[in-house]
Amino acid sequence: SRLRQEDFPPRIVEHPSDVIVSKGEPTTLNCKAEGRPTPTIEWYKDGERVETDKDDPRSHRMLLPSGSLFFLRIVHGRRSKPDEGSYVCVARNYLGEAVSRNASLEVALLRDDFRQNPTDVVVAAGEPAILECQPPRGHPEPTIYWKKDKVRIDDKEERISIRGGKLMISNTRKSDAGMYTCVGTNMVGERDSDPAELTVFER
Protein backbone atom coordinates (compact mmCIF):
# COMPACT_ATOMS: atom_id res chain seq x y z
CA SER A 1 0.00 0.00 0.00
CA ARG A 2 1.21 3.55 -0.79
CA LEU A 3 2.42 5.76 2.04
CA ARG A 4 -0.16 8.43 2.76
CA GLN A 5 1.07 11.77 4.05
CA GLU A 6 -1.03 11.65 7.21
CA ASP A 7 0.01 8.11 8.14
CA PHE A 8 2.48 7.57 10.98
CA PRO A 9 4.01 4.58 12.75
CA PRO A 10 2.71 3.29 16.09
CA ARG A 11 3.76 4.73 19.41
CA ILE A 12 2.77 3.49 22.86
CA VAL A 13 0.95 6.19 24.80
CA GLU A 14 -0.01 4.08 27.82
CA HIS A 15 2.37 1.42 29.09
CA PRO A 16 1.37 -1.53 31.28
CA SER A 17 2.34 -1.38 34.95
CA ASP A 18 3.58 -4.08 37.32
CA VAL A 19 0.77 -5.77 39.19
CA ILE A 20 0.39 -8.23 42.06
CA VAL A 21 -2.98 -9.96 42.03
CA SER A 22 -4.63 -12.80 43.92
CA LYS A 23 -5.34 -16.12 42.22
CA GLY A 24 -8.86 -16.25 40.81
CA GLU A 25 -9.25 -12.47 40.73
CA PRO A 26 -9.66 -10.39 37.56
CA THR A 27 -7.02 -7.89 36.49
CA THR A 28 -6.04 -5.72 33.54
CA LEU A 29 -2.71 -4.89 31.95
CA ASN A 30 -3.18 -1.57 30.20
CA CYS A 31 -1.81 -0.68 26.80
CA LYS A 32 -2.76 2.13 24.48
CA ALA A 33 -1.14 2.96 21.16
CA GLU A 34 -1.50 5.69 18.58
CA GLY A 35 -0.75 5.40 14.88
CA ARG A 36 -2.32 5.70 11.46
CA PRO A 37 -3.63 3.34 10.30
CA THR A 38 -4.78 2.30 13.77
CA PRO A 39 -2.23 -0.24 15.00
CA THR A 40 -3.08 -3.82 15.86
CA ILE A 41 -2.01 -4.88 19.34
CA GLU A 42 -0.54 -8.18 20.44
CA TRP A 43 0.74 -9.22 23.84
CA TYR A 44 3.81 -11.29 24.66
CA LYS A 45 4.69 -13.02 27.93
CA ASP A 46 8.30 -13.98 28.55
CA GLY A 47 8.85 -13.60 24.80
CA GLU A 48 5.97 -15.86 23.77
CA ARG A 49 2.78 -14.58 22.15
CA VAL A 50 -0.20 -14.60 24.50
CA GLU A 51 -3.38 -16.27 23.29
CA THR A 52 -6.56 -14.32 23.95
CA ASP A 53 -10.26 -14.66 23.21
CA LYS A 54 -9.42 -13.55 19.65
CA ASP A 55 -7.60 -16.89 19.20
CA ASP A 56 -9.82 -19.07 21.38
CA PRO A 57 -13.27 -17.93 22.57
CA ARG A 58 -12.83 -20.03 25.74
CA SER A 59 -9.69 -18.15 26.78
CA HIS A 60 -9.68 -16.47 30.19
CA ARG A 61 -7.76 -13.55 28.65
CA MET A 62 -9.52 -10.90 26.59
CA LEU A 63 -7.97 -8.35 24.25
CA LEU A 64 -9.99 -5.19 24.85
CA PRO A 65 -10.71 -2.71 22.02
CA SER A 66 -8.30 -0.26 23.68
CA GLY A 67 -5.49 -2.81 23.39
CA SER A 68 -5.46 -3.65 27.10
CA LEU A 69 -5.26 -7.27 28.21
CA PHE A 70 -8.05 -8.26 30.58
CA PHE A 71 -7.86 -11.44 32.66
CA LEU A 72 -11.27 -12.79 33.67
CA ARG A 73 -9.52 -14.63 36.50
CA ILE A 74 -5.87 -15.18 37.28
CA VAL A 75 -5.02 -18.84 36.76
CA HIS A 76 -2.29 -20.16 39.02
CA GLY A 77 -1.72 -23.75 40.08
CA ARG A 78 0.71 -25.71 42.22
CA ARG A 79 2.92 -26.13 39.17
CA SER A 80 1.41 -24.49 36.07
CA LYS A 81 1.42 -20.71 36.35
CA PRO A 82 0.26 -19.57 32.92
CA ASP A 83 -0.47 -15.95 33.83
CA GLU A 84 2.61 -15.11 35.89
CA GLY A 85 5.47 -13.51 34.01
CA SER A 86 6.80 -10.46 32.21
CA TYR A 87 4.49 -8.88 29.63
CA VAL A 88 4.90 -6.41 26.77
CA CYS A 89 2.35 -5.16 24.30
CA VAL A 90 3.39 -4.66 20.70
CA ALA A 91 1.57 -2.21 18.41
CA ARG A 92 1.97 -2.69 14.65
CA ASN A 93 0.93 -1.06 11.42
CA TYR A 94 2.49 -1.08 7.97
CA LEU A 95 4.94 1.64 8.96
CA GLY A 96 6.47 -0.27 11.84
CA GLU A 97 5.99 -1.42 15.39
CA ALA A 98 6.30 -0.09 18.93
CA VAL A 99 7.02 -2.19 22.01
CA SER A 100 5.86 -1.19 25.47
CA ARG A 101 7.90 -1.31 28.64
CA ASN A 102 7.93 -4.64 30.47
CA ALA A 103 5.30 -5.17 33.15
CA SER A 104 5.47 -8.05 35.59
CA LEU A 105 2.34 -9.88 36.65
CA GLU A 106 2.91 -11.61 39.97
CA VAL A 107 0.39 -13.78 41.77
CA ALA A 108 -0.15 -13.13 45.44
CA LEU A 109 -0.24 -16.14 47.68
CA LEU A 110 -0.50 -17.00 51.33
CA ARG A 111 0.16 -20.58 52.36
CA ASP A 112 -1.69 -22.25 55.22
CA ASP A 113 1.15 -23.68 57.27
CA PHE A 114 3.04 -21.42 59.67
CA ARG A 115 6.82 -21.65 59.46
CA GLN A 116 6.76 -21.45 63.27
CA ASN A 117 3.72 -21.71 65.51
CA PRO A 118 3.89 -20.04 68.92
CA THR A 119 4.40 -22.43 71.84
CA ASP A 120 2.99 -22.41 75.37
CA VAL A 121 4.84 -20.17 77.83
CA VAL A 122 4.81 -20.24 81.64
CA VAL A 123 6.17 -17.19 83.52
CA ALA A 124 6.15 -15.73 86.99
CA ALA A 125 4.18 -12.49 87.44
CA GLY A 126 6.46 -9.51 86.93
CA GLU A 127 8.75 -11.40 84.56
CA PRO A 128 8.79 -10.78 80.80
CA ALA A 129 7.07 -13.20 78.42
CA ILE A 130 8.04 -13.77 74.79
CA LEU A 131 5.89 -15.57 72.23
CA GLU A 132 7.42 -16.26 68.82
CA CYS A 133 5.82 -16.86 65.46
CA GLN A 134 6.89 -17.09 61.84
CA PRO A 135 3.97 -16.61 59.44
CA PRO A 136 3.30 -18.84 56.43
CA ARG A 137 5.24 -18.21 53.25
CA GLY A 138 3.50 -15.66 51.10
CA HIS A 139 3.81 -13.03 48.42
CA PRO A 140 3.80 -10.20 49.28
CA GLU A 141 5.62 -11.25 52.47
CA PRO A 142 2.93 -11.51 55.19
CA THR A 143 2.87 -9.17 58.15
CA ILE A 144 1.66 -10.39 61.53
CA TYR A 145 -0.48 -9.27 64.41
CA TRP A 146 -1.50 -11.07 67.59
CA LYS A 147 -4.81 -11.94 69.22
CA LYS A 148 -5.39 -12.77 72.86
CA ASP A 149 -8.50 -14.81 73.53
CA LYS A 150 -9.63 -14.00 69.95
CA VAL A 151 -9.31 -10.21 70.42
CA ARG A 152 -6.63 -8.25 68.58
CA ILE A 153 -3.86 -6.99 70.86
CA ASP A 154 -3.21 -3.27 70.94
CA ASP A 155 0.55 -2.94 70.66
CA LYS A 156 0.36 0.70 71.71
CA GLU A 157 0.15 -0.49 75.30
CA GLU A 158 3.54 0.36 76.82
CA ARG A 159 4.18 -3.13 78.23
CA ILE A 160 3.65 -4.79 74.86
CA SER A 161 5.96 -4.68 71.87
CA ILE A 162 5.74 -6.59 68.61
CA ARG A 163 8.94 -6.84 66.60
CA GLY A 164 9.17 -9.17 63.63
CA GLY A 165 7.54 -12.37 64.78
CA LYS A 166 8.02 -11.74 68.51
CA LEU A 167 5.38 -10.63 70.96
CA MET A 168 7.08 -9.32 74.12
CA ILE A 169 5.17 -8.58 77.28
CA SER A 170 7.24 -6.94 79.99
CA ASN A 171 6.25 -7.11 83.65
CA THR A 172 3.55 -9.73 83.12
CA ARG A 173 0.33 -9.71 85.16
CA LYS A 174 -2.19 -12.44 85.93
CA SER A 175 -4.55 -10.72 83.49
CA ASP A 176 -2.08 -11.40 80.65
CA ALA A 177 -2.77 -15.14 80.96
CA GLY A 178 -4.78 -16.60 78.11
CA MET A 179 -4.68 -18.08 74.62
CA TYR A 180 -2.53 -16.22 72.11
CA THR A 181 -2.84 -16.57 68.34
CA CYS A 182 -0.51 -15.17 65.71
CA VAL A 183 -2.22 -13.95 62.53
CA GLY A 184 -0.34 -13.77 59.22
CA THR A 185 -1.87 -11.41 56.68
CA ASN A 186 -1.36 -10.07 53.18
CA MET A 187 -3.59 -9.09 50.25
CA VAL A 188 -4.77 -12.70 49.86
CA GLY A 189 -6.27 -12.84 53.35
CA GLU A 190 -5.41 -14.03 56.84
CA ARG A 191 -4.16 -17.24 58.42
CA ASP A 192 -4.36 -18.08 62.13
CA SER A 193 -1.59 -19.98 63.88
CA ASP A 194 -2.24 -22.72 66.38
CA PRO A 195 -3.04 -21.04 69.71
CA ALA A 196 -0.44 -20.92 72.47
CA GLU A 197 -1.26 -20.60 76.16
CA LEU A 198 0.44 -18.03 78.36
CA THR A 199 0.31 -19.04 82.02
CA VAL A 200 1.25 -16.43 84.63
CA PHE A 201 1.77 -17.69 88.19
CA GLU A 202 2.23 -15.76 91.42
CA ARG A 203 5.55 -16.29 93.14
Epitope: D46, E48, E51, D56, V75, R78, S80, K81, D83, G85
Partner: antibody, heavy 118, light 105 residues
Framework: EVQLVQSGAEVKKPGASVKVSCKAS????????MHWVRQAPGQGLEWMGW????????EFPQKFQGRVTMTRDTSITTAYMDLSRLRSDDTAVYYC???????????WGQGTMVTVSS | DIVMTQSPSSLSASVGDRVTITCRAS??????LNWYQQKPGKAPKLLIY???SLQSGVPSRFSGSGSGTDFTLTISSLQPEDFATYYC???????FGGGTKVEIK
Protein backbone atom coordinates in the same frame (compact mmCIF):
# COMPACT_ATOMS: atom_id res chain seq x y z
CA GLU B 1 -7.67 -24.53 19.09
CA VAL B 2 -5.63 -25.85 22.00
CA GLN B 3 -4.22 -29.25 21.11
CA LEU B 4 -1.42 -31.74 21.62
CA VAL B 5 -0.39 -33.89 18.66
CA GLN B 6 1.85 -36.89 19.27
CA SER B 7 4.20 -38.82 17.01
CA GLY B 8 3.20 -42.14 15.47
CA ALA B 9 3.30 -45.72 16.74
CA GLU B 10 6.65 -47.39 17.37
CA VAL B 11 7.82 -51.00 17.50
CA LYS B 12 11.05 -51.57 19.44
CA LYS B 13 13.21 -54.46 20.55
CA PRO B 14 13.97 -55.11 24.24
CA GLY B 15 16.92 -53.03 25.42
CA ALA B 16 16.33 -50.30 22.84
CA SER B 17 15.11 -46.74 23.47
CA VAL B 18 12.08 -44.86 22.20
CA LYS B 19 11.50 -41.12 21.84
CA VAL B 20 7.93 -39.84 21.63
CA SER B 21 7.15 -36.25 20.65
CA CYS B 22 4.22 -34.04 21.62
CA LYS B 23 3.59 -30.89 19.58
CA ALA B 24 1.61 -28.22 21.46
CA SER B 25 -0.39 -25.49 19.75
CA UNK B 26 -3.01 -22.88 20.56
CA UNK B 27 -1.62 -21.84 23.93
CA UNK B 28 1.42 -20.36 25.66
CA UNK B 29 3.67 -23.43 25.75
CA UNK B 30 5.96 -22.24 28.55
CA UNK B 31 3.08 -21.43 30.90
CA UNK B 32 1.92 -24.99 31.51
CA UNK B 33 3.69 -28.08 32.81
CA MET B 34 3.64 -31.07 30.48
CA HIS B 35 3.15 -34.57 31.86
CA TRP B 36 3.52 -38.04 30.44
CA VAL B 37 1.13 -40.84 31.34
CA ARG B 38 1.15 -44.40 30.03
CA GLN B 39 -1.42 -47.17 29.86
CA ALA B 40 -0.50 -50.81 29.31
CA PRO B 41 -3.09 -52.91 27.41
CA GLY B 42 -6.16 -53.45 29.61
CA GLN B 43 -4.54 -51.59 32.52
CA GLY B 44 -4.99 -48.28 34.30
CA LEU B 45 -3.25 -44.92 33.93
CA GLU B 46 0.32 -44.58 35.20
CA TRP B 47 1.92 -41.15 35.70
CA MET B 48 5.51 -41.02 34.43
CA GLY B 49 6.63 -37.50 35.28
CA TRP B 50 6.57 -33.86 34.22
CA UNK B 51 8.64 -31.21 32.50
CA UNK B 52 8.39 -27.47 33.05
CA UNK B 53 8.76 -26.11 29.50
CA UNK B 54 9.81 -22.71 30.84
CA UNK B 55 13.12 -23.92 32.30
CA UNK B 56 13.39 -27.62 31.46
CA UNK B 57 13.05 -28.80 35.07
CA UNK B 58 11.74 -32.35 35.38
CA GLU B 59 10.41 -34.70 38.03
CA PHE B 60 9.73 -38.43 37.84
CA PRO B 61 8.37 -41.03 40.24
CA GLN B 62 10.98 -43.40 41.66
CA LYS B 63 9.93 -46.17 39.29
CA PHE B 64 11.10 -44.28 36.19
CA GLN B 65 14.15 -42.45 37.52
CA GLY B 66 17.25 -43.25 35.51
CA ARG B 67 15.29 -44.66 32.59
CA VAL B 68 13.13 -41.76 31.43
CA THR B 69 14.27 -38.42 30.04
CA MET B 70 11.95 -35.51 29.31
CA THR B 71 13.04 -32.59 27.16
CA ARG B 72 11.45 -29.78 25.22
CA ASP B 73 12.17 -27.44 22.32
CA THR B 74 10.42 -24.14 22.99
CA SER B 75 11.16 -22.86 19.47
CA ILE B 76 8.82 -25.49 18.04
CA THR B 77 6.61 -25.86 21.17
CA THR B 78 7.30 -29.58 21.39
CA ALA B 79 7.91 -31.86 24.38
CA TYR B 80 9.72 -35.19 24.19
CA MET B 81 9.76 -38.31 26.32
CA ASP B 82 12.64 -40.75 25.93
CA LEU B 83 12.40 -44.17 27.59
CA SER B 84 15.52 -46.34 27.55
CA ARG B 85 16.33 -50.01 28.25
CA LEU B 86 12.90 -51.04 27.02
CA ARG B 87 11.28 -54.22 28.34
CA SER B 88 8.20 -56.08 27.15
CA ASP B 89 6.18 -54.62 30.04
CA ASP B 90 6.83 -51.12 28.64
CA THR B 91 4.38 -51.97 25.85
CA ALA B 92 1.71 -49.32 26.31
CA VAL B 93 -0.01 -46.26 24.92
CA TYR B 94 1.97 -43.18 25.96
CA TYR B 95 0.09 -39.89 26.41
CA CYS B 96 1.30 -36.35 26.91
CA UNK B 97 -1.03 -34.13 28.93
CA UNK B 98 -1.04 -30.45 29.80
CA UNK B 99 -1.51 -29.52 33.44
CA UNK B 100 -3.90 -26.60 33.80
CA UNK B 101 -3.62 -23.83 36.36
CA UNK B 102 -6.31 -25.77 38.24
CA UNK B 103 -3.85 -28.66 38.83
CA UNK B 104 -5.58 -31.08 36.46
CA UNK B 105 -4.73 -32.60 33.08
CA UNK B 106 -7.13 -30.67 30.88
CA UNK B 107 -5.64 -31.34 27.43
CA TRP B 108 -4.35 -34.75 26.30
CA GLY B 109 -2.51 -35.94 23.22
CA GLN B 110 -4.09 -38.68 21.13
CA GLY B 111 -1.63 -41.27 22.44
CA THR B 112 1.33 -43.11 20.93
CA MET B 113 1.38 -46.90 20.91
CA VAL B 114 4.81 -48.31 21.76
CA THR B 115 5.22 -52.06 21.30
CA VAL B 116 8.30 -53.78 22.73
CA SER B 117 8.80 -57.20 21.23
CA SER B 118 11.70 -59.39 20.23
CA ASP C 1 3.77 -41.82 47.91
CA ILE C 2 0.09 -41.13 48.41
CA VAL C 3 -1.90 -44.18 47.26
CA MET C 4 -5.33 -43.73 45.67
CA THR C 5 -7.82 -46.58 46.12
CA GLN C 6 -10.91 -46.56 43.92
CA SER C 7 -14.03 -48.62 44.49
CA PRO C 8 -15.71 -50.49 43.06
CA SER C 9 -13.34 -51.68 40.32
CA SER C 10 -16.38 -52.29 38.11
CA LEU C 11 -20.14 -51.88 38.29
CA SER C 12 -23.17 -52.65 36.15
CA ALA C 13 -25.90 -50.07 35.81
CA SER C 14 -28.81 -49.09 33.60
CA VAL C 15 -29.57 -45.89 31.75
CA GLY C 16 -31.18 -43.44 34.20
CA ASP C 17 -29.48 -44.95 37.26
CA ARG C 18 -27.67 -42.85 39.83
CA VAL C 19 -24.06 -44.03 39.99
CA THR C 20 -21.53 -43.34 42.74
CA ILE C 21 -17.81 -44.07 42.58
CA THR C 22 -15.53 -43.52 45.56
CA CYS C 23 -11.85 -42.75 45.85
CA ARG C 24 -9.81 -42.89 49.04
CA ALA C 25 -6.36 -41.34 49.58
CA SER C 26 -3.85 -42.95 51.93
CA UNK C 27 -3.34 -39.52 53.54
CA UNK C 28 -5.07 -36.15 53.40
CA UNK C 29 -4.87 -34.37 50.04
CA UNK C 30 -7.22 -31.50 50.94
CA UNK C 31 -9.25 -30.91 47.74
CA UNK C 32 -6.47 -31.84 45.32
CA LEU C 33 -8.47 -34.49 43.49
CA ASN C 34 -9.52 -34.82 39.85
CA TRP C 35 -11.81 -37.22 38.00
CA TYR C 36 -11.38 -38.43 34.41
CA GLN C 37 -13.50 -40.44 31.99
CA GLN C 38 -11.90 -42.74 29.42
CA LYS C 39 -13.55 -44.61 26.57
CA PRO C 40 -11.86 -47.52 24.75
CA GLY C 41 -9.15 -46.39 22.34
CA LYS C 42 -9.43 -42.74 23.43
CA ALA C 43 -7.43 -40.41 25.65
CA PRO C 44 -8.85 -39.64 29.10
CA LYS C 45 -11.09 -36.61 29.46
CA LEU C 46 -11.15 -34.32 32.48
CA LEU C 47 -14.55 -34.22 34.22
CA ILE C 48 -13.98 -32.73 37.68
CA TYR C 49 -11.04 -30.82 39.14
CA UNK C 50 -10.33 -29.67 42.70
CA UNK C 51 -12.73 -32.36 44.04
CA UNK C 52 -15.94 -30.59 43.04
CA SER C 53 -15.41 -28.12 40.17
CA LEU C 54 -17.02 -29.14 36.88
CA GLN C 55 -14.73 -28.82 33.87
CA SER C 56 -16.06 -26.57 31.11
CA GLY C 57 -18.28 -28.47 28.65
CA VAL C 58 -18.96 -31.41 30.99
CA PRO C 59 -22.67 -32.18 31.56
CA SER C 60 -24.07 -31.15 34.94
CA ARG C 61 -25.16 -34.73 35.73
CA PHE C 62 -21.54 -35.27 36.79
CA SER C 63 -20.62 -34.00 40.24
CA GLY C 64 -17.79 -34.47 42.69
CA SER C 65 -17.57 -34.13 46.44
CA GLY C 66 -15.29 -34.77 49.37
CA SER C 67 -12.07 -33.47 50.90
CA GLY C 68 -9.23 -34.84 52.97
CA THR C 69 -9.11 -38.56 52.23
CA ASP C 70 -12.59 -39.53 50.96
CA PHE C 71 -14.03 -38.44 47.62
CA THR C 72 -17.03 -39.29 45.46
CA LEU C 73 -17.93 -38.98 41.80
CA THR C 74 -21.67 -39.08 41.17
CA ILE C 75 -23.52 -39.44 37.87
CA SER C 76 -27.08 -38.38 38.71
CA SER C 77 -28.77 -40.06 35.74
CA LEU C 78 -26.61 -42.39 33.68
CA GLN C 79 -26.72 -41.81 29.92
CA PRO C 80 -25.69 -44.26 27.17
CA GLU C 81 -22.52 -42.25 26.45
CA ASP C 82 -21.44 -42.50 30.11
CA PHE C 83 -20.48 -46.18 29.89
CA ALA C 84 -16.71 -45.88 30.27
CA THR C 85 -13.89 -46.22 32.78
CA TYR C 86 -13.45 -43.52 35.41
CA TYR C 87 -10.21 -42.60 37.17
CA CYS C 88 -9.48 -40.42 40.15
CA UNK C 89 -6.14 -38.62 40.42
CA UNK C 90 -4.58 -36.72 43.28
CA UNK C 91 -2.82 -33.59 42.07
CA UNK C 92 -0.28 -33.41 44.90
CA UNK C 93 1.81 -36.40 43.75
CA UNK C 94 -0.19 -36.93 40.55
CA UNK C 95 -0.85 -40.66 40.90
CA PHE C 96 -4.10 -42.21 39.62
CA GLY C 97 -6.56 -44.57 41.21
CA GLY C 98 -7.01 -48.03 39.68
CA GLY C 99 -10.14 -47.12 37.72
CA THR C 100 -13.82 -48.04 37.81
CA LYS C 101 -15.42 -49.58 34.74
CA VAL C 102 -19.10 -48.68 34.35
CA GLU C 103 -20.82 -51.35 32.24
CA ILE C 104 -24.34 -51.81 30.91
CA LYS C 105 -26.50 -54.06 33.08
Amino acid sequence: EVQLVQSGAEVKKPGASVKVSCKASGYTFTGYYMHWVRQAPGQGLEWMGWINPKNGDTEFPQKFQGRVTMTRDTSITTAYMDLSRLRSDDTAVYYCARESGDDAFDIWGQGTMVTVSS
Amino acid sequence: DIVMTQSPSSLSASVGDRVTITCRASQSISSYLNWYQQKPGKAPKLLIYAASSLQSGVPSRFSGSGSGTDFTLTISSLQPEDFATYYCQQSVGLFFGGGTKVEIK
